[in-house]
């Protein structure tokens, strides 16, 4: 069964800077990635990002760096400045989109006792919804 | 709950212009769709896709509107446009906005799969 991953990090130099970082662990090719905050896109959540292999990756405030680590994994450098940055308790979703899977979504959030620059290495985040 | 409102529908004449304006809102959060498209119903006829628009900003227009009518999204994502010239008798109809998302992110055929919808303004082509 595909899963997806979820990591959040607060960057040590700049302690209202997040780093998101979100993987698909399954087979088929991903179409489409969403990055949202707040809560899952068009749920409660804002989207911050959207990664598509061949046309490209448009972001919004208060994200600054969106990017293809690998063909199945991304990440996402977030602003930390004015009343839209982040905070630590803040949920990040990824949802992914792959053929011939479907969508598969999941959130997380900075670990509570998280020290900056400090993360835990990448786990499965609880799936959150499979269309 | 995601609205959709409509605005920029009047009566203009033969050849004239509009320009028609669409605002995503959702409360507690900014939603910015995938796609988001205008539709039209003209008295007496079923509704028909006019103009699609997704997130990266790949158009598509019924063959009926192409070269007169143009379809725009704002940086921010959630505001759609539609620029109509050249307009003609045929083009008077109820103009809706629709959005929603599709898995790859580009518009669906037809408009399958926008589960919002506007409730339309009217533009009405007439000397």
């Known amino acids: 069964t595909p899963e997806v991953w979820v990591q959040v990090r607060m960057e040590a130099t700049e302690l209202s800077s997040f780093t998101i970082r979100c993987g698909f662990l399954g087979s088929g090719s991903i179409s489409l990635v969403t990055v949202s905050w707040g809560g899952p896109n068009g749920a409660g959540g804002t989207t911050l990002a959207v990664l598509h292999p061949e046309r490209g990756i448009r972001q919004w405030a208060p994200a600054r760096q969106a990017r293809w680590e690998t063909q199945s994994s991304i990440s996402l450098i977030l602003e930390g400045s004015g009343a839209s940055s982040p905070c630590a308790n803040t949920t990040f979703c990824c949802k992914f989109a792959s053929f011939p899977e479907g969508s598969w979504e999941a959130c997380g959030s900075l670990p509570p006792s998280s020290d900056p620059g400090l993360s835990a290495p990448p786990t499965p985040a609880p799936i959150l919804r499979a269309d | 709950q995601v609205q959709l409102v409509e605005s920029g529908g009047g009566l203009v004449q033969p050849g004239g212009s509009l320009r028609l304006s669409c605002v995503a809102s959702a409360s507690g959060f900014t939603y910015r769709p995938y796609c988001m498209a205008w539709f039209r119903q003209a008295p007496g006829k079923e509704r028909e896709a006019v103009a699609g628009i997704d997130i990266f900003g790949g158009t598509t227009y019924a063959d009926s509107v192409k070269g007169r009518f143009t379809a725009s999204r704002d940086n921010a994502g959630f505001s759609l446009y539609l620029q109509m010239n050249s307009l003609r008798a045929e083009d008077t109809a109820v103009y809706y906005c629709?959005?929603?998302?599709?898995?790859?992110?580009?518009?669906?055929?037809?408009?399958?799969?926008?589960?919002?919808w506007g409730q339309g303004t009217m533009v009405t082509v007439s000397s």
């Open positions: 629709a959005a929603g998302d599709s898995p790859d992110g580009r518009c669906p055929p037809l408009g399958q799969g926008l589960n919002y």
